[in-house]
């Protein structure tokens, strides 16, 4: 058993049928010694009476909010929330496995640039009683300082019967240095809690890893004299590092028909222009990437050649 | 990735190709070394990131553009000179073209080549035959230290007596090679900034 | 003591469709995830399908995938496979099995798919 | 399609030690954790190792299981008549969990 927070502890039990479960010992935050009754949730069953209750933790039945009574008076609480370990694996029910870019990756995280900012989110099929809180370090060893803030819900889908809820949080590294060759990884820490029960997730990666810039802005057509070709131009996105000379990007410049199944034109370039042949009802996407590391392609701008 | 390579002219920052090249050369190596190390830890989560030219060159600090001076965590230890040589600075004058940064990306390239050669000649006795350092990798890293011209004393190839354990240099071999892309993808970002200065 | 009674095996002929159950008692059903192992006469386990404690996530082996499907009904503290398009080489004992460090198994119940 | 690697059978004589291997890889016993069944004929697997090396209560003492890496061995010090059987050993792969891998089993002969 270990504390969460003030007067909220997790027990952590091996978890199958017929298990022996765990024995914890609650003691009474109080000065008193004696006429202390125990009661659970809201029961008024008297559970157990003296300054320690002891309880054999099995399962959710035995979890909840315990609290120590004096004559009619609530001297403390302790809410115990159970932690699931199926087959030496902890349990993962809360959120769902996004498979992307690999199976069990149930927190997902990118940044727009080099800044040491950088979001994560992360799914779930529960609507209440649930809530997350995030920790982030450089480092696990010797961790070096990343501050988040507080996850919120950021979108509501829904997947066939099943409404998905989207959770998100922003973390900034306290002290980064955007040119900085990174050694050791970010890592971050989620906490779920769904009724009584207690999880939770990991992730670790590095910056340079989950960069996906934001698409390319001012995206411009202009039509070249007596001629099916237009000069496409576009500037670096606002969000991206500087100076660009040192953080450049390449850029991949689309001309796509109407129709999904016409045949796409590629070009791939370092400059912020480009010259296509544009076809009737044809538009024309550009997305970026880091020219020297490659990480994820931003997602499309586009225009409508006409 | 099938980009378009730009070839540069030959007035411009002649370091660029080269270490564009070397990138490129060090990407392909890495991925082979993944491919054919399947069944060893080599991937970017697996390994530990070692940096052997750690507290003995200086190169993010002496190559930090100058609008990132004025960002405290990246000034960690910078010394900064402004003194130029070297065939790179052909007769370029720019504040942030300093023999400090391209010396020690020399110094760099220098230990790697140092390094990579060593391991190879371990890899060379391996029985299995599995694996072995693309020359055209060991190349591009001696054009670029051509090209960057710098005179500094050889050092001597580490040779061991020892009976080498091909196990743990594989592993090793991953760890230089990741760590060896990072710090090309740093050169590549101040060879490209001073091409623009 | 946790019980898992199995039924529902026999011979059924290729193309047909069969539905094991798996019935639990001696525990709080609802609360543990459940698999499916299959063994072929002489053959090794062979692992068939999982669903988690409430039946929101079901994973199968890619040898029955489209064609198997596990799902349970925890009011009736039970367990099912239903097997369709059946072939020679589903012809294996099926054991139902809970998830968990220390695990309980059913007695097992032969399907043979035989023409 | 078995990941797990286990010698088809071993054999011993009543009071020997037997021990059977199960080789994996990384993403499998090397990250999880394994288990060993016995199997009797016409009968369903007994669990008789988890964690690797804990055994459940009524699993007698001369059974034990160690992991080092990414293989897994199952050791019988003693091995008596009543110990013939299949031996599987178990552990899930960190990118299909909870789907269970099975060794190829063994078959443990007590001759004489």
């Known amino acids: 058993i270990w504390e969460l927070k003030k007067d909220v502890y997790v027990v952590e039990l091996d978890w199958y049928p017929d298990a022996p479960g765990e024995m914890v010992v609650l003691t009474c935050d109080t000065p008193e010694e004696d006429g202390i009754t125990w009661t659970l949730d809201q029961s008024s069953e008297v559970l157990g009476s003296g300054k320690t209750l002891t309880i054999q933790v099995k399962e959710f039945g035995d979890a909840g909010q315990y609290t120590c009574h004096k004559g009619g008076e609530v001297l403390s609480h302790s809410l115990l929330l159970l932690h699931k370990k199926e087959d030496g694996i902890w349990s993962t029910d809360i959120l769902k496995d996004q498979k992307e870019p690999k199976n069990k990756t149930f927190l997902r995280c990118e940044a727009k640039n080099y800044s040491g900012r950088f979001t994560c989110w992360w799914l779930t099929t529960i609507s209440t009683d649930l809530t997350f809180s995030v920790k982030s370090s450089r480092g696990s060893s010797d961790p070096q300082g990343v501050t988040c803030g507080a996850a919120t819900l950021s979108a509501e889908r829904v997947r066939g019967d099943n409404k998905e809820y989207e959770y998100s949080v922003e973390c900034q590294e306290d002290s980064a240095c955007p040119a900085a060759e990174e050694s050791l990884p970010i890592e971050v820490m989620v906490d779920a809690v769904h009724k009584l029960k207690y999880e939770n997730y990991t992730s670790s990666f590095f910056i340079r890893d989950i960069i996906k810039p934001d698409p390319p802005k001012n995206l411009q057509l202009k039509p070249l004299k007596n001629s099916r070709q237009v000069e496409v131009s576009w500037e670096y996105p606002d969000t991206w590092s500087t100076p660009h000379s040192y953080f450049s990007l390449t850029f991949c410049v689309q001309v796509q028909g109407k129709s999904k199944r016409e045949k796409k034109d590629r070009v791939f370039t370092d400059k912020t222009s480009a010259t296509v042949i544009c076809r009737k009802n044809a538009s024309i996407s550009v997305r970026a990437q880091d020219r020297y590391y490659s990480s994820s392609w931003s997602e499309w701008a586009s225009v409508p050649c006409s | 990735r099938n980009l378009p390579v730009a070839t540069p002219d030959p007035g411009m920052f002649p370091c660029l190709h080269h270490s564009q090249n070397l990138l490129r050369a060090v990407s392909n190596m890495l991925q082979k070394a993944r491919q054919t190390l399947e069944f060893y830890p080599c991937t970017s989560e697996e390994i530990d990131h070692e940096d052997i030219t750690k507290d003995k060159t200086s190169t993010v600090e002496a190559c930090l553009p100058l609008e990132l001076t004025k960002n405290e965590s990246c000034l960690n230890s910078r010394e900064t000179s402004f003194i130029t040589n070297g065939s790179c600075l052909a007769s370029r004058k720019t504040s942030f073209m300093m023999a400090l940064c391209l010396s020690s990306i020399y110094e760099d390239l220098k230990m790697y080549q140092v390094e990579f050669k060593t391991m190879n000649a371990k890899l060379l006795m391996d029985p299995k035959r599995q694996i072995f350092l693309d020359q055209n990798m060991l190349a591009v890293i001696d054009e670029l230290m051509q090209a960057l011209n710098f005179n500094s004393e050889t050092v001597p190839q580490k040779s061991s007596l020892e009976e080498p354990d091909f196990y743990k240099t594989k592993i090793k071999l991953c760890i230089l090679l990741h760590a060896f892309r990072i710090r090309a993808v740093t050169i590549d970002r101040v060879m490209s900034y001073l091409n623009a200065s | 003591q946790v019980q898992l009674v199995q039924s529902g095996g026999g011979v059924v002929q290729p193309g047909r469709s069969l539905r094991l159950s798996c019935a639990a008692s001696g525990f709080t059903f609802s609360s543990y995830g459940m698999h499916w192992v299959r063994q072929a006469p002489g053959k090794g386990l062979e692992w068939v399908a999982f669903?988690?404690?409430?039946?929101?996530?079901?994973y199968y082996a890619d040898s029955v995938k489209g064609r198997f499907t596990i799902s349970r009904d925890n009011s009736k503290n039970t367990l099912y496979l239903q097997m369709k398009s059946l072939r020679a080489e589903d012809t294996a004992v099926y054991y139902c099995k809970t998830h968990g460090s220390h695990d309980n198994w059913g007695q097992g119940t032969m399907v043979t798919v035989s023409s | 399609s078995y990941v797990l690697t286990q010698p088809p059978s071993v054999s011993g004589t009543p009071g020997q030690r037997v021990t059977i291997s199960c080789s994996g890889g990384?993403?499998?016993?090397?990250?999880?954790?394994v288990k060993w069944y016995q199997q009797l004929p016409g009968t369903a697997p007994k669990l008789l190792i988890y964690?690797?090396?804990q055994r459940p209560s009524g699993v007698p003492d001369r059974f034990s299981g160690s992991k080092s890496g990414t293989s897994a061995s199952l050791a019988i010090t003693g091995v008596q008549a009543e110990d013939e059987a299949d031996y599987y050993c178990q552990s899930y792969d960190r990118g299909t969990h909870p789907a269970l891998l099975f060794g190829t089993g063994t078959k443990v002969t007590v001759l004489g």
């Open positions: 669903i988690r404690y409430d039946g929101s996530n079901k």
């Open positions: 964690w690797n090396d």
């Open positions: 990384r993403s499998n016993i090397g990250s999880n954790t």
